[in-house]
């Protein structure tokens, strides 16, 4: 991603010759989209509208019950992250359909493209805590009987969204937006001005930190939960719980294209082919990670559904019912309250 | 052969206008931007914006933003550079400049002979 | 604006010698098609600037094989296999993959 990861349309003939050709004119401008652009383009217009709608949702059943219930609460802070995610869309979006070009001026390339990683980055921290929150249900129930509550919770989701702001700063401050004199055009990018080894440790702790660490971390807490409910048949409802690994897994799934192309672009030269062909990709990767900006909403009507047979109540009670259910957890001889779960968020083209 | 030729010399004095024309020949006048590039005595080359004549689009370097005004005309294969509100360093020899559009070579690769403009009081 | 710095800003050199000319940009000239457009221009004197070598290392239509360019990213070089007499002038390095277009301050080759 040195330089610009944003592509320009092809020009055919324009730059693949080394002899003059006097007659064939180029146009200043493209009205072509690549195919990639225009599936990126499908996908954020979906997304949009399924992640609004139904992170608003989300956001309208948990923030009542969010003073009493730590399920709530961790449903509650995915969505905002989700919300605030999808807002960037419509200009991301814009941006796409005039080739990349990008004329919301510096502030607006700095901030929203940063929406995304901020998105991710506080996803997996959220999802993290609330993979810590179900494995001491399970390990320590009786901590939890003692200690936890909604206040802590809070205090664990304001860390969360702390340390997501902090490892944003980077491309939040490396984005500028770069006037090309031919074709005309203003991109919005990042510019590590020309420090590889700058580049590609950003790229790297991105790759560490929010993608390989928590895979490693989730697996392994989740392989020791599933291991010990199963074995242990000892708990009541493992709604909460497959709802958690549903949404953990559509994160790894959905953020894996952009994490991999992004780590393989800041070690190839930006004229090289190969790092070319996956700036063509770019936009598509980023829509691809952004997809978990609404699958969230709809893993819980899933489960919802699922859980009920079928569909008899009205989608909020639906939501209301898998967000902030209370399940039991046995674990000897006591009996602690618990709530679970997560969503999953992206990133976009830094 | 591609061809730019200017209009001769100017004395302006400081605050009025001038106006340079380029006429270019010898190649697909609409498909080329013109830029202008100026040079003081003894300093390096500046580039002030560009015009693409086919639709009159225009480009301006920031620093003259709002002094200078570049047109074309096709009937004529001609375009024309007006600089206001002149003031002595302003004084440079002018350049018109072909930036190729239909080619490979994606470079500014044929300039005019060059205007001086003085500007004295 | 991307500023290119040009060095050395005077170039004595024996005629039949070689010559080497610098040019670094205060930022990537990459552009997002992959291209570079790093252009160097002559401008002998009383003339008008001539291209010489456009995108780091094409000679232009009617450019001599002695003159060669090379580079990558920020760094730029211009060379002269074997000066001769005619290759007198200020050579100027000039970026167009961004706006506004800027030049080197420009090298002033002249013979010992």
């Known amino acids: 991603m040195n330089s610009f990861n944003y592509t320009t349309p092809d020009y055919g003939h324009y730059d693949d010759k080394d002899t003059l050709d006097l007659n064939t004119p180029v146009d200043k401008t493209s009205n072509t989209l690549r195919v990639p652009d225009i599936l990126a383009l499908v996908i954020f217009a979906v997304v949009f509208l399924v992640g609004v709608l139904g992170n608003a949702l989300v956001v309208w059943v948990t923030a009542f019950e969010a003073k009493r219930t730590i399920n709530a609460i961790w449903f509650l802070n995915l969505a905002v992250a989700d919300f605030l995610s999808c807002l960037a869309l419509p200009i991301l979006f814009t941006s796409i359909v005039q080739h990349h070009h990008w004329p919301f001026g510096g502030a607006a390339c700095s901030i929203l493209p940063s929406l995304i990683l901020l998105n991710m980055y506080a996803s997996i921290l959220l999802l993290a805590t609330i993979s810590a929150d179900r494995f001491l249900l399970v390990f320590k129930p009786i901590w939890c009987q003692n200690f936890r509550g909604a206040g802590l919770a809070w205090i664990a989701c304001a860390v969360a969204w702390g340390l997501a702001l902090l490892l944003t700063i980077p491309s939040f401050l490396y984005r500028v937006v770069r006037e090309e004199y031919f074709p005309p055009k203003v991109l919005c990018g990042v510019d590590y001005s020309h420090d590889k080894r700058r580049e590609r440790a950003v790229a790297i702790v991105r790759l560490v930190l929010g993608f390989l660490w928590p895979l490693l971390t989730l697996t392994i807490c989740y392989t020791f939960i599933l291991l010990r409910t199963w074995s242990r048949r000892a708990t009541r409802s493992t709604k909460t719980l497959k709802v958690v690994v549903a949404v953990v897994a559509s994160f790894f799934i959905f953020w894996l294209p952009y994490q991999v192309t992004g780590i393989m672009m800041s070690f190839l030269e930006p004229s090289s082919p190969t790092f070319l062909l996956l700036n063509k990709l770019d936009s598509l990767c980023v829509s691809f990670a952004y997809i978990n900006c609404c699958i969230n909403p709809i893993i819980y009507v899933v489960a919802g559904q699922g859980f009920q047979g079928r569909l008899r109540k009205s989608l909020p009670s639906l939501l209301r019912n898998v967000l902030t259910e209370e399940s039991v957890v046995r674990e000897s001889k006591s009996f602690t309250r618990s709530t679970v779960d997560t969503m999953a968020q992206k990133t976009q083209a830094v | 052969q591609v061809q730019l030729v200017q209009s001769g010399a100017e004395v302006k004095k400081p605050g009025a206008s001038v106006k340079v024309s380029c006429k270019a020949s010898g190649y697909a006048f609409s498909n080329s931007w013109m830029n202008w590039v100026r040079q003081a005595p003894g300093q390096g080359l500046e580039w002030m914006g560009r015009?693409?004549?086919?639709?009159?689009?225009?480009k301006y370097n920031g620093k003259f933003k709002g002094r200078v005004t570049m047109t074309a005309d096709t009937s004529t294969s001609t375009v024309y550079m007006e600089l206001s509100s002149l003031r002595s360093e302003d004084t440079a020899v002018y350049y018109c400049a072909r930036f190729l559009l239909i080619s490979t070579v994606t470079a500014v690769d044929y300039w005019g002979q060059g205007t001086l403009v003085t500007v004295s009081s | 604006d991307v500023v290119m710095t040009q060095s050395p800003l005077s170039l004595p050199v024996t005629l039949g010698e070689p010559a080497s000319i610098s040019c670094r940009s205060s930022q990537s000239l990459v552009h997002s098609n992959g291209n570079t457009y790093l252009h160097w221009y002559l401008q002998k004197p009383g003339q008008s600037p001539q291209l010489l070598i456009y995108?780091?290392?094409n000679r232009f239509s009617g450019v001599p094989d002695r003159f060669s360019g090379s580079g990558s990213g920020t760094d730029f070089t211009l060379k002269i296999s074997r000066v001769e007499a005619e290759d007198v002038g200020v050579y100027f390095c000039?970026?167009?993959?961004?706006?506004?277009?800027?030049f080197g301050q420009g090298t002033k080759l002249e013979i010992k």
């Open positions: 995108k780091v290392s």
């Open positions: 015009i693409y004549p086919g639709d009159g689009d225009t």
């Open positions: 000039s970026q167009s993959t961004l706006v506004p277009l800027t």
